[in-house]
Amino acid sequence: LQDLCSNCPAGTFCDNNRSQICSPCPPNSFSSAGGQRTCDICRQCKGVFKTRKECSSTSNAECDCISGYHCLGAECSMCEQDCKQGQELTKKGCKDCCFGTFNDQKRGICRPWTNCSLDGKSVLVNGTKERDVVCGPSPADLSPGASSATPPAPAREPGHSPQ
């Protein structure tokens, strides 16, 4: 005997109470594949979640986070607090990046400034909490006659306070 349920398209469910007739999914439910015996309840985007895409009979709702938060996890299962640039999120909230580190985004951790000298270069622009240092040509690349009027700022070592 052929299973009539396999003929039920997405957006419907196979109603065993009605001789395996394909019935539309009730309001606030969906089935994304054919042959389903039940429809799934639509996700509700509430609290810190806001609706990015409404639920339809064939697909679940998609959520986003309200302003000040960003999605974490598969299908935005969590919302994590944003921080300002120049900060990172800790267990005690947003904290400024330590000297010698930076974060140019509203999420993620503070990362160490690039060490220009490792590439044989000099620091062209000093780093800040929000921006990495900009490395310039190595001192050897600057021929005596071609050096700029303003010498590059000296590199600051992490752990030393600015004067």
């Epitope: 609290g47 810190v48 299962s77 969590m78 919302c79 994590e80 607090q81 267990k91 005690k92």
Partner: nanobody, 121 residues
Framework: QLQLVESGGGLVQPGGSLRLSCAAS????????IGWFRQAPGKEREGVLC????????IYADSVKGRFTISRDNAKNTVYLQMNSLKPEDTAVYYC??????????????WGQGTQVTVSS
Amino acid sequence: QLQLVESGGGLVQPGGSLRLSCAASGFTLADYAIGWFRQAPGKEREGVLCISSSGDVTIYADSVKGRFTISRDNAKNTVYLQMNSLKPEDTAVYYCVAPRICSTYSSDDYWGQGTQVTVSS
């Protein structure tokens, strides 16, 4: 049944004060952080303040710095939002929520039904 109930809202004149309460039933509030959010008419919900289970405070909205404070009384299973120097732009429905930590919220967090705060002369 696990629930959060907000109270203390009402109508207040600009410059006035209100103290909102968030009482938990069915679970121990001390195990959770408690965040206060608000939603003004026609606007998106926004974070206001949060207090961690250990008492650390996170300020989400810069506009409430120096005016709003949050505290908890674990013996009473209640968290309070003290709102001073209220402004018309503080008018909103205020909600409390119980995440595990202040920085991260999930679909499983408990939310209250909200209490209306109206600041008007």
